[in-house]
């Protein structure tokens, strides 16, 4: 019985060239968190495993880093970063819960003068 | 080349026990999760139990826990399945596999299989 | 327990068919679903993971699709090859379940 549920920053966005943290929190269960997943589209990004830490898919390495916590942040921002981000939860006993979170990403001038979403 | 070669099989009488191992070579035992799946004769497949990587977690199936016991040596290339109080429908041919490091469920390479009998 | 049902249980086709087999789930799974291929007399193989992605050196004529509770694997361009049973796996919750197989023969 899945009664957990995945809290995400939701929408959010950030300028051209700069970082942002992706987060999500289960809550909600006392499930045992074994692993975390952050994909994009279809592309794994990175893994947060319980017994091997994290590992970083080797094509994003120089831009992505791993937390805080489970979290994680994405370096030197292009446009063709703006899309659908996932955090995937494998938990024991619960099963996977999945995260969404759509991050875009705006040229400098826009970021300034009323970004959509704004970053806290 | 992934190699998993599973012994230890055979005739148990029902209440007896048994003890499974899996040599494991041709990739890095201690990075992956590891799984023991049972085939029965009618070509049903279950899965039994699953260990994590650094043996931190396992978990099973109700149909077995409590009288199964997944273990690994990291150092020796090994798994195993101590396997106590058989029953006749644990009569199976066992398989070992290794799980996806991105996918904890998915079984991406499997043993030859070892047969266990179960019967008085 | 999640069950998965297969369908059909086997599967008789011609050499060149297109063929398809479904998979159903008693819940929704989301795309946490794996294909498996057991030759005669041999050990099951990873076929297609995440509902839809080729495990590596899969022959493209294999493609998954599907999510929530309703799957299908279908083989285009039937080889002699690919006489076997099918059996989808779900990895949405524990206990990881299968489906009953489908057996796949040649007319």
């Known amino acids: 019985m899945m009664t957990g549920t995945i809290e995400t920053t939701g929408n959010i966005s950030a300028e051209k060239g700069g970082s942002i943290i992706l987060q999500c929190h289960l809550s909600s269960t006392t499930a045992q968190v074994t692993q975390v997943n952050w994909e994009q589209q279809d592309q794994l990004l990175a893994i947060c495993n319980a017994d091997l830490g994290w590992h970083i898919s080797p094509s994003f390495k120089d831009r992505v880093a791993p937390g805080p916590g489970l979290g994680l942040t994405l370096q030197s921002l292009t446009v063709n970063d703006t899309g659908e981000y996932f955090c995937i939860y494998h938990t024991y006993p619960d099963g996977t819960y999945t995260g969404r979170i759509f991050l875009e990403v705006l040229e400098s001038s826009v970021a300034e003068h009323g970004a959509r979403f704004q970053i806290p | 080349e992934v190699k998993l070669v599973e012994s230890g099989g055979g005739l148990v009488k029902p209440g007896g026990s048994l003890k499974l191992s899996c040599a494991a070579s041709g990739f890095a035992f201690s990075s992956f999760d590891m799984s023991w799946v049972r085939q029965t004769p009618e070509k049903r497949l279950e899965w039994v139990a699953v260990i994590s990587s650094g043996g931190s977690y396992t978990f099973y199936p109700d149909s077995v826990k409590g009288r199964f016991t997944i273990s690994r040596d990291n150092a020796r290339n090994t798994l195993y399945l101590q396997m106590s109080s058989l029953r006749s429908e644990d009569t199976a041919l066992y398989f070992c596999t290794r799980q996806d490091y991105r996918y904890p469920y998915i079984m991406d390479y499997w043993g030859q299989g070892t047969s266990v009998t179960v019967s008085s | 327990d999640i069950q998965m049902n297969q369908s059909p249980s086997s599967l008789s086709a011609s050499l060149g068919d297109t063929i398809t087999i479904t998979c159903h789930a008693s819940q929704n799974i989301n795309v946490w679903l794996s294909w498996y291929q057991q030759k005669p007399g041999n050990i099951p193989k990873l076929l297609i993971y995440k509902a839809s992605n080729l495990h590596t050196g899969v022959p493209s004529r294999f493609s998954g699709s599907g999510s929530g509770a309703g799957f299908t694997l279908t083989i285009s361009s039937l080889q002699p090859e690919d006489i076997a049973t099918y059996y989808c796996?779900?990895?949405?919750?524990?206990?990881?379940?299968f489906g009953g197989g489908t057996k796949l023969e040649i007319k």
């Open positions: 796996q779900q990895g949405q919750s524990y206990p990881w379940t």
